[in-house]
Interface confidence: medium
């Protein structure tokens, strides 16, 4: 080993070196939070870049750059350090059009904390391992969601467009002429029935157990879907989103009530199955895989 390499190894394994890097990263993060940083922070930026460059140089001299098993670039954590340094020099010395976009990569410096703090390294390692292990569960989840999305598509396609429409039309008014002239929500409220405080027209259905319209209104299928058109089973993708919403239980009870009002109470069975399988079983299966991966990483 050359004297330079010996010195580099001594520095690298020293606890003060790790402390210095950790303090630098944390200080750098504090400086990044500044809204309008004063001019002198520019010099501090250069100092940080210098320290990171020194750290990488020490690692390269001690371990070698890329040839060999334990060299600098063979460790994925060092890829992050390398990218941070490359972007630091790029934003500073190379005149690239949209620099603000490149400055975004400064945030990666905060991620350097992970490689320095051992506990964090374990957690992130477990996270990466769990993602690898999750592939099978994810395939199963997507498959299940797809199957139920297709069932939902067949059962509820177009149902959420059902609305309670006013009976008393003027002499020459038709549904089409009305829909063409409706612009504001106030116009809609003239012809469709709205519950107090609701932003969508009252949903209804044509089956005996679906929601009925109040007196003076009949059920028609026209206009857009509820929630600005985002809630529907009209296409596979919208149905898939609705199923994902059920699985994650994201305001799912509203979707449940809307669909049951438009399609009928019988379809409660569909929601029971989806919630049990998707929300209770699959979500817990994902959590179990993550927990297993973390346990393995700890051992």
């Amino acid at each position: 080993f050359s004297p330079l390499r010996r010195i580099s190894i001594k520095i690298l394994v020293h606890s003060l070196f790790s402390m210095l890097i950790m303090c630098t990263i944390l200080t750098n993060c504090i400086f990044m939070t500044m809204n309008n940083p004063p001019d002198w922070t520019k010099n501090v930026e250069y100092t940080f870049t210098g320290i990171y460059t020194f750290e990488s140089l020490v690692k390269i001299l001690a371990r070698g750059f890329c040839v060999g098993e334990f060299t600098f670039l063979r460790d994925p954590w060092n890829w992050l350090d390398f990218v941070v340094i490359v972007f630091a020099y790029l934003t500073e010395f190379v005149n690239l059009g949209n620099v603000s976009a490149l400055r975004t990569f400064r945030v990666l410096r905060a991620l350097k904390t992970i490689s320095v703090i051992p506990g964090l390294k374990t957690i992130v390692g477990a996270l990466i391992q769990s993602v690898k292990k999750l592939s099978d569960v994810m395939i199963l989840t997507v498959f299940c969601l797809s199957v139920f999305a297709l069932i939902g598509l067949q059962l509820f396609m177009g149902n959420l467009k059902h609305k309670c429409f006013r009976n008393s039309l003027e002499n020459n008014e038709t549904l089409e002429s009305i829909m063409n002239t409706l612009e504001s929500e106030e116009d809609f409220r003239k012809y469709f029935y709205y519950l107090e405080g609701s932003k969508d027209a009252l949903l209804c259905g044509f089956s005996t157990d679906s929601g009925q319209c109040p007196e003076g209104y009949t059920c028609v299928k026209i206009g857009r879907n509820p929630d600005y058109g985002y809630t529907s089973f009209d296409t596979f993708s919208w149905a898939f989103l609705a199923l994902f919403r059920l699985m994650t239980q994201d305001y799912w009870e509203n979707l449940y009530q809307q669909t049951l009002r438009a399609a009928g109470k019988t379809y409660m069975i569909f929601f029971v199955v989806v919630i049990f399988l998707g929300s209770f079983y699959l979500i817990n299966l994902i959590l179990a895989v993550v927990a297993m991966a973390y346990e393995e990483q700890n051992q």
């Epitope: 089409e176 009925q212 003076g216 059920c219 299928k221």
Partner: nanobody
Framework: EVQLVESGGGVVQPGGSLRLSCAAS????????MAWYRQAPGKQRELVAY??????ISYADSVKGRFTISRDNSKRVYLQMNSLRPEDTALYYC???????????????WGQGTLVTVSS
């Protein structure tokens, strides 16, 4: 393609009666509301009466007590016209708000019209 076919029109004396019928032909998933309109020569088309699936019925003031609208099944509507007057002379149109199939939106459909002439 869905079509509305009216029948029952003709010439009748004042005070007489007529029964108009309207049937929806073709594929029909759901009929929401059926109505009768009329258009007298040189006048605008006006609503005579309508009936909804829930049984809501409404009549124009000029025909109240004389005309009766009814619906025997989801595809057919009738207009029983009693005590006819000369001013009832018009072309009577059937109109329905219906869905041809479960995937289509509700649309307005008109019949071709049937002529009712009240004269002595």
């Amino acid at each position: 393609e869905v079509q509305l076919v009216e029948s029952g029109g003709g010439v009748v004396q004042p005070g007489g009666s007529l029964r108009l019928s309207c049937a929806a032909s073709g594929p029909v998933f759901n009929i929401n509301r059926m109505a009768w309109y009329r258009q007298a020569p040189g006048k605008q088309r006006e609503l005579v009466a309508y009936v909804t699936p829930t049984g809501d019925i409404s009549y124009a003031d000029s025909v109240k007590g004389r005309f009766t609208i009814s619906r025997d099944n989801s595809k057919r509507v009738y207009l029983q016209m009693n005590s006819l007057r000369p001013e009832d002379t018009a072309l009577y149109y059937c109109r329905a708000l219906l869905q041809p199939d479960s995937y289509s939106n509700t649309r307005t459909y008109w019949g071709q019209g049937t002529l009712v002439t009240v004269s002595s």
